[in-house]
């Protein structure tokens, strides 16, 4: 009896794992083995596919074959018993195009209100992704174990921290990788769960902002308690996206080590131009807080995008705000020759309810105010250039009282 060729051959490639699966054409024939050949583009001869010769099952692994993953290959399969079937040719394919990204490895660390996620590719030193290793981005799904309500976080790098969580609570998450340059989305990792710790005695510093004064950067933050010391550390932002980097090491800013105020000043030109991350930690001598949320700090933008200055003309039911160029030391205005958009935040002095106005003009009306009421206003500038997409810090708040009724004209 003539052996029939196997049919429906599927090639599955996950990272550097090359798996072939196929269907037997004739289940009634026993003790059949299967063998594959492969052919590279531009070659006439067929070569025996190592790892896929005389296979008794309907699956084989040819991961040991050192292929150029960007080069097209063709496969063929036949059944063998006493005689052999005809060859069945599989459509040619390029391994890289066919490959899927496997589940990443995930390692979690818990804080009281945050989880640190360390992500690395599932296959170390992968041949498939050798040219793309630094281009991986990750996305994750996280949920409270007790509720199951999922939150998705996109476009994160190999080290990510999720903030604003609840203490002593179990969170679960799963992560998948993507290569946006090649339109590839990976498969999810197994679910990892971790319980956040008991709430720390000292909260982390909050609302970190960087501004420029003279030739210095001024770093300010808020803190709940007095009589504390603080330290500030920096990290090159690129190291965040560099998987398994042994150079991922936060460094101190000398002027910001053990400072007793909620600000520190350091010179602009100690940093080479670029993008950094900054974080602050508080200590009372016995205990230390967890690190603050990391802020991104871009020397190029920080150096020129200063908060706007403004004057307020108070009426009974509105403020007229006139925005001017920010001032440097010596009261000289800074010329900012790129289009800006202004974000104005205002609130009643006795309330925390903030309202926001976004305006391109430099004269802005804040309407619907109550007479004889103190309102506070702060403003910041944003670049309108999509590539820059940067913001200044907020100006200091200015508080004014509205006039008595009937003075709106």
């Amino acid at each position: 009896k003539n052996l029939k060729s196997p049919q429906k051959v599927e090639v599955d490639i996950i990272d550097d794992n090359f798996i072939l699966r196929w269907n037997r054409s004739d289940e009634s024939v026993g003790n059949v083995t299967f063998s594959f050949d492969y052919q590279k583009t531009g070659m006439d001869n067929w070569i025996k596919l190592s790892g896929c010769q005389n296979i008794t099952s309907t699956k084989c692994n040819f991961s040991s074959l050192k292929l150029n993953v960007y080069e097209e290959i063709k496969l063929r399969i036949r059944a063998e018993k006493e005689n052999t079937s005809s060859w069945y040719e599989v459509d040619s394919f390029t391994p890289f195009r066919k490959a899927q990204i496997g589940p990443p490895e995930v390692h979690l660390e818990a804080e009281d209100k945050a989880i640190v996620i360390h992500i690395s590719p599932g296959t170390k030193d992968s041949v498939m992704w050798a040219l793309d290793g630094l281009s991986f981005t990750y996305s994750l799904v996280i949920w409270k174990n007790s509720s199951g309500v999922e939150e998705r976080i996109e476009n994160i790098y190999s080290r990510h921290k999720i903030y604003k969580l609840s203490p002593e609570t179990t969170y679960c998450l799963k992560v998948k990788a993507a290569l946006l340059t090649s339109w590839k989305i990976g498969v999810y990792s197994p679910v990892h769960c971790i319980k956040t710790t008991v709430e720390n005695e000292l909260p982390p510093p909050e609302n970190i902002e960087v501004s420029v004064q003279n030739q210095n950067y001024v770093l300010k933050w808020d803190y709940t308690y007095a009589n504390m010391t603080f330290q500030v550390q920096w990290l090159h932002a690129f190291l965040k996206r560099n998987p398994g980097n042994h150079l991922y090491k936060w460094k101190q800013i000398p002027d910001c080590e053990n400072v007793k105020t909620t600000q520190c000043v350091f010179p602009q030109n100690v940093f080479q131009k670029g993008i950094y991350l900054l974080r602050v930690q508080a200590s009372d001598g016995n205990n230390t807080s967890f690190w603050s949320e990391e802020i991104k700090f871009d020397t190029e933008i920080q150096a020129f995008l200063l908060p706007p200055v403004f004057n307020i003309r108070s009426l009974s039911d509105s403020f007229h705000i006139y925005i001017g160029a920010p001032k440097q030391s010596g009261n000289t205005p800074v010329i900012q020759d790129y289009p800006l958009i202004y974000e104005i935040i205002f609130w009643e002095n006795t309330s925390n309810a903030e309202r926001k106005i976004i305006e391109k003009k430099t004269d802005v009306t804040v309407p619907n105010l109550k007479p004889l009421t103190v309102y506070c206003v702060k403003a910041r500038a944003h670049t309108m250039d999509e590539k820059l997409n940067k913001s200044s810090v907020f100006s200091d708040a200015v508080c004014e009282k509205t006039k008595p009724g009937n003075t709106s004209k």
Epitope: W234, H236, Q252, P254, E257, N269, V270, Q272, Y276
Partner: antibody
């Protein structure tokens, strides 16, 4: 591990233009900052400038700008081009990496340039 | 530019001894100081940055100290591999500048 290796012509005549190469292995030059520093025969070290991960350059403002720094990311190399060299450019040239502040954590072995007529 | 004055220019010491090298800046550099060690025919190696932080892999017999304009590098219990030249470098402002070096020789 990060490794840097300089190469250059070794000998040059005054007024020539030449290029020194720094080849980086174990790390991508599309991260961090890549600097040139030279050491004169009397052992004085002088910082020259850098090219950053994004391709921005910055030079020592105290030096006459007869040089430029460029890179080729496909080769993971960066270069120091010296224009109209004089005998005062005779030195050992080092390439070095920095993370952001101007201190240098990885250095190449150095390449010696002698300018002589 | 800030000038860095290093002293002594050279010193001799024996294995096991303790030595100190000092560096004076022409202005306050607020601890933005690094120290390097260079052996003959080799490249400089970072020892200390931020005036007192040891770089990765540097033995604990090295220590940096100082503030303002005055800084020093101390080497306890000298080892044979410690001989060579030492340089300080500030990075408080651009351009960063180096000290003139201290040559440490075996007595």
């Amino acid at each position: 591990e990060v490794q840097l290796q300089e190469s250059g012509p070794g000998l040059a005549k005054p007024s020539q233009t030449l290029s020194l190469t720094c080849s980086v292995t174990g790390y991508s030059i599309t991260s961090d900052y890549w600097n040139w520093i030279r050491k004169f025969p009397g052992n004085k070290l002088e910082y020259m400038g850098y090219i950053s991960y994004s391709g921005n350059t910055d030079y020592n403002p105290s030096l006459k700008s007869r040089f430029s720094i460029t890179r080729d990311t496909s080769k993971n190399q960066f270069y120091l081009q010296l224009n109209s060299v004089t005998t005062e450019d005779t030195a050992t040239y080092y390439c070095a990496r920095s993370e952001g502040m101007y201190f240098f954590d990885y250095w190449g072995q150095g390449t010696t340039l002698t300018v002589s007529s | 530019d800030i000038q860095m004055t290093q002293s002594p220019a050279s010193l001799s010491a024996s294995v096991g001894e303790t030595v100190s090298i000092t560096c004076r800046a022409s202005g306050n550099i607020h601890n933005y100081l690094a120290w390097y060690h260079q052996k003959q025919g080799k490249s400089p190696q970072l020892l200390v940055y931020n005036a007192k932080t040891l770089a990765d892999g540097v033995p604990s017999r090295f220590s940096g100290s100082g503030s303002g304009t005055q800084y020093s590098l101390k080497i306890n219990s000298l080892q044979p591999e410690d001989f060579g030249s030492y340089y300080c470098q500030h990075f408080w402002s651009t351009p960063p500048t180096f000290g003139s070096g201290t040559k440490l020789e075996i007595k």
